[in-house]
Interface confidence: low
């Protein structure tokens, strides 16, 4: 079976596909299992290195899991006639490390795409939008599943992985109809701030099992349809007032916060107050403190303001400032000592002069003291200019 998976553009692919015999409705590619009744094709765990070219036109659900596809080029699923019925595409665990721009073009009904468990060292910004236009044609995608797509450290590009994924999600505003986005288990340290603003239709967002420390710069404000927000198993320490207000303002949301290392000090007071009155957080009675040591395993809902104190330790921002100040002062001190050392002879001479001047000065004081002590010389002392 010929395949144009190595093609870097969909145009040559379409040409070759057009010249081949159009696939028969009932044919099934080698190494695949097909069910026309279920509109399903499964090419699972077959070590395929390319997407089969001869997929049947009836396919609605295509499973290409457990293969060795490596690269998904532009137009990887483009056919003539197109696979107009394809609605669900599962490519999980197929050792993909590169998804190029336009890889999912010419799939007009594609609603669900699963790229999970592929070590994506390169995800083109135009993987989902299909073009580099500032505003692309809307993608039909409703569900995008990108769990555990982080590559191993040695395969990572220099650029931030979070930034690479974010660029693909916002390109051309193509994913404005996305309802579900799963980004679990990707070692995310932060969420790029403009991503959610470009996904206004989200109902379900899964960011669980990442390394998110803070949501301070993330805005949920325009996710007015958001129904489930999964933040379990991250590194969240506290949610600040801005985030709390935004979550409370979403009319429909349920938030999942289990298994985060909550820091129960004075900065937690607002979050505890909010937790006690909100219906937004699912399983809020399970949330417990991780730090400081004396608060470990205390239930957040059972805390009151007296429990939430801060040791008289400088906050991290001030600590950083004072460390910097200390370094500057040390440098100034070192320069000062160096100057003293280089001018040691002059300083020695200067010191002698100072000593002599001081001696004369002190003798003057002694003289004045003696005059003041003798009542007979009082008038003289008042006129004296010592």
């Amino acid at each position: 079976t010929s395949s144009a998976s190595s093609s870097s553009s969909s145009a040559p692919f379409l040409a070759s596909a057009a010249s081949a015999q159009p696939p028969l409705p009932d044919q099934c590619p080698a190494l695949c299992e097909c069910s026309e009744a279920a509109r399903t094709v499964k090419c699972v765990n077959r070590n395929l290195t390319e997407v089969p070219t001869d997929l049947p036109l009836y396919v609605r659900n295509l499973f290409l899991t457990g293969n060795q596809l490596a690269v998904l080029p532009a137009g990887a699923f483009a056919r003539r006639p197109p696979l107009a019925e394809l609605a669900a595409l599962n490519l999980s665990g197929s050792r993909l490390d590169e998804v190029r721009g336009g890889a999912f073009e010419h799939l007009p009904s594609l609603r669900q795409l699963d790229l999970s468990h592929n070590p994506l060292a390169y995800l083109s910004p135009f993987a989902f939008s299909g073009s580099n236009a500032s505003i692309s044609a809307p993608s039909p995608l409703v569900e995008l599943i990108l769990n555990h797509i982080v590559p191993p450290d040695d395969k990572r590009q220099n650029r931030s992985f979070e930034g690479m994924v974010a660029a693909a999600l916002v390109a051309g505003r193509a994913l404005q109809g996305l309802h579900l986005l799963e980004l679990a288990s990707n070692h995310f340290l932060y969420l790029p701030r403009d991503v959610l603003a470009q996904l206004p239709s989200l109902r379900y967002l899964d960011l669980s099992n990442n390394s998110l420390v803070s949501l301070t710069y993330v805005s949920f404000r325009n996710l007015t349809h958001l129904e489930s927000l999964h933040l379990e198993d991250n590194a969240l320490k506290v949610l600040h007032n801005g985030t709390l207000a935004e979550l409370q303002g979403l009319p429909h949301v349920r938030v999942f916060l289990d298994n985060n290392p909550w820091v129960c000090d004075c900065h937690m007071a607002d979050m505890v107050t909010w937790l006690k009155q909100t219906g937004v957080v699912q399983g809020k009675d399970r949330l417990t403190c991780a730090f400081p040591e004396k608060m470990r395993n205390r239930v957040l809902l059972e805390l009151n303001s007296a429990d939430l104190d801060c040791d008289p330790i400088l906050p991290p921002s001030l600590q950083t400032s004072y460390v910097f100040l200390g370094i500057v002062l040390a440098l100034i001190g070192a320069i000062f000592l160096l100057v003293l050392y280089l001018n040691r002879k002059g300083i020695k001479k200067w010191m002698h002069n100072i000593r002599d001047a001081c001696r004369d000065h002190m003798e003057g004081y002694h003289y004045r003291y003696e005059i003041n002590a003798d009542p007979r010389l009082t008038n003289l002392s008042s006129n004296s200019d010592v």
């Epitope: 659900n61 669900a88 609603r111 409703v142 109902r203 129904e227 489930s228 429909h252 349920r254 219906g279």
Partner: antibody
Amino acid sequence: QSVEESGGRLVTPGTPLTLTCTASGFSLSDYTMGWVRQAPGKGLEWIGIINGYGSTYYANWAKGRFAISKTSTTVDLKITSPATEDTATYFCARGDTGRTYDMHFNLWGQGTLVTVSS
Amino acid sequence: AYDMTQTPASVSAAVGGTVTIKCQASESIRSWLAWYQQKPGQPPKLLIYSASTLASGVSSRFKGSGSGTQFTLTIGDLESADAATYYCQQGYTSSNLDNAFGGGTEVLVK
């Protein structure tokens, strides 16, 4: 917690009819509410839903033929121009949550019978 | 448009036996499927949601499985009270659908 339908009756074709679902023991702003109908001897037919914050969704065949709205305690289903094939028992049902996604009905009314006949 | 096809339309089994009902979605609905039981003159009752999660107060004799497009409801250790019509319902989307429910399966207990 309960829901109860009312307003079902015999109507002539083309005469608009409004069915009302009254909710007790819970807030309609926290749940998605749906209407489902069942023609005599037939299966269940999904008409549409209104979610916690008031957005409505209809089955393709129901668009334009039905309108769902709500107040703080009731959910209405208006049959804009009833036809004989709209004869059925109409059920009001509450979703498990306020979601429109991953939605299922865990609380049902007993239904109200609408008969459309000339 | 997310059509739900239930098979068989009717099934009969003896008390103590097992019944299996299948539901097929025309497109993948992940695990967002519910099963209901309806007896004559009564409203439907939720049995299972999210394909396999038992609703509150429902006997563990009812078991749901499947994901994507293929789903199964299995009723084990059949009792006469299980005689009813069973419906599947997709909860994946409320947009662009004709009927969220399957056509129903009548279970007769001998």
